[in-house]
């Protein structure tokens, strides 16, 4: 029987910069029941606080609700693991909420085959940013990535769309049914999950184009 091993806070995420959650990995348990507590202070403070919510984020987590989340101040936190034989502490972790945002997937993905009379046909898609993300403040730049594949294919083809919320793809296999998805990430945050798949049937008379794709 030993004191617990050193825990590690390995992940912090915010869906929208208004709340966030951090998760830790326990070290070895020393063969005894172990209690974990997360304490933190904000930059410029000396007063330590305990995690406000150990429940919402699941096991080995700390959730900071709206009233505990500030974008303006860095959080300095550590986890303490304690059993009957002693304690161990994680390394201190510094968290700036701006840089842990993992948004929800983009919304309202629509995909259409466009067949203009004077030009080659193309696949056109558009989407909306996730609702929880406030892009009007200016500091929040969302980047988008699209992936698509014929329904029965194994490999996805991915395209980086930058900040655009529309995209054209010019080279597709006629007669195939395609799955299309989009995801987003803030410039310094994390990729969202992929949006639910949208299906599109490519007409048999769709003419393959020499060019592969381009931004709209």
């Amino acid at each position: 029987q030993l004191p617990p091993g050193k825990p590690e806070i390995f992940k912090c995420r915010s869906p929208n910069k208004e709340t966030f959650t951090c998760w830790w990995r326990p070290g070895t348990d020393g063969g005894l029941p172990t209690n974990y507590s997360l304490t933190y202070h904000r930059e410029g403070e000396t007063l330590m606080h305990e995690c406000p919510d150990y429940i919402t984020g699941g096991p080995n987590s700390c959730h900071f609700g709206k009233q505990y989340t500030s974008m303006w101040r860095t959080y300095v936190m550590m986890v303490n693991a304690t059993n009957q034989m002693g304690s161990s502490f994680s390394d201190e972790l510094y968290v700036d909420v701006t840089y842990i945002v993992q948004p929800d997937p983009p919304l309202e993905l629509t995909v259409e085959v466009k067949q203009p009379e004077d030009r080659k046909p193309y696949l056109w898609m558009k989407w909306s940013p996730p609702t929880l993300i406030d892009l009007k403040t200016g500091w929040f730049t969302l980047l988008y990535e699209i992936r698509l594949k014929p329904e029965k294919a194994a490999e996805w083809e991915t395209h980086f769309a930058g900040q655009q919320t529309e995209f054209k793809i010019l080279s597709l296999h006629p007669g195939q049914k395609y799955l299309v998805q989009v995801r987003c990430k803030p410039d310094h945050g994390y990729w969202s999950a992929w949006s639910p798949a949208t299906f599109i049937q490519i007409p048999s008379d769709f003419i393959m184009n020499d060019h592969h794709h381009h931004h709209h």
Epitope: M71, D91, Y94, V95, D96, T98, Y99, W139
Partner: antibody
Framework: QVQLQQPGAELVMPGTSVKLSCKAS????????IHWVKQRPGQGLEWIGE????????NYNQKFKGKATLTVDRSSSTAYMQLSSLTSEDSAVYYC???????????WGQGTLVTVSA | DVVMTQTPLSLPVSLGDQASISCRSS???????????LHWYLQKPGQSPKLLIY???NRFSGVPDRFSGSGSGTDFTLKINRVEAEDLGVYFC?????????FGSGTKLEIK
């Protein structure tokens, strides 16, 4: 404890390439961005770019685009920077650094001295 | 790119004195999220830089309280009260508000 291990030195020929390594230990490699910084002898520091090991997403200083390529090998918890078409201007110490969940970095490797010489 | 100008380039001090280093940026370092990402590093001979102060005035873990940072916008100062021998080296300011991140040219703190 957190460590970023870099080889001490590399001697390379002009016109060739070199791939510098930065082996991370003591933490979950995919959690934090890795930065690369150049320091020429007796001079200041220049930020080259950064990479997110979780998905290999990169941001580069425009000045080093085409010169530096950042990659990671998640299986060995190692970050790499390849420098191409080397000239004497590329002779410098190159540091890797690790951020927290922040945009500044507190942990640095010991640096690799790259000497470009025929 | 944001240019960081440090003064003085060299700062001779006697042990126990106060030292003050100035850093000026070519544009405001207030991020659109309201934070100011101005940091100070110390590089001792033959070593990699070590973080002293993050976001203008916050001491990093383990940094003695004789180090303090202040300033706003484009003008920033690092003060060292009662300089000790272990404080000697080159001090760099750095900004991470704007990409690319940039550093000052350094201030060498040396014994008078």
């Amino acid at each position: 404890q957190v460590q970023l291990q870099q080889p001490g030195a590399e001697l390379v020929m002009p016109g060739t390439s070199v791939k510098l390594s930065c082996k991370a230990s003591g933490y979950t490699f995919t959690s934090y961005w890795i930065h690369w910084v150049k320091q020429r002898p007796g001079q200041g520091l220049e930020w080259i770019g950064e990479i997110d090991p979780s998905d290999s997403y990169t941001n580069y200083n425009q000045k080093f685009k085409g010169k530096a390529t950042l990659t990671v090998d998640r299986s060995s918890s190692t970050a790499y920077m390849q420098l191409s078409s080397l000239t004497s201007e590329d002779s410098a110490v190159y540091y890797c650094g690790r951020s927290f969940f922040t945009n500044w970095f507190a942990y640095w490797g010991q640096g690799t001295l790259v000497t470009v010489s025929a | 790119d944001v240019v960081m100008t440090q003064t003085p380039l060299s700062l001779p001090v006697s042990l126990g004195d106060q030292a003050s280093i100035s850093c000026r940026s070519s544009q405001s370092l207030v991020h659109s999220n309201g934070n100011t990402y101005l940091h100070w590093y110390l590089q001792k001979p033959g070593q990699s830089p070590k973080l002293l102060i993050y976001k203008v005035s916050n001491r990093f873990s383990g940094v003695p309280d004789r180090f303090s940072g202040s300033g706003s916008g484009t003008d920033f100062t690092l003060k060292i009260n009662r300089v000790e021998a272990e404080d000697l080296g080159v001090y760099f300011c750095s900004q991470s508000t704007h990409v690319p991140f940039t550093f000052g040219s350094g201030t060498k703190l040396e014994i008078k």
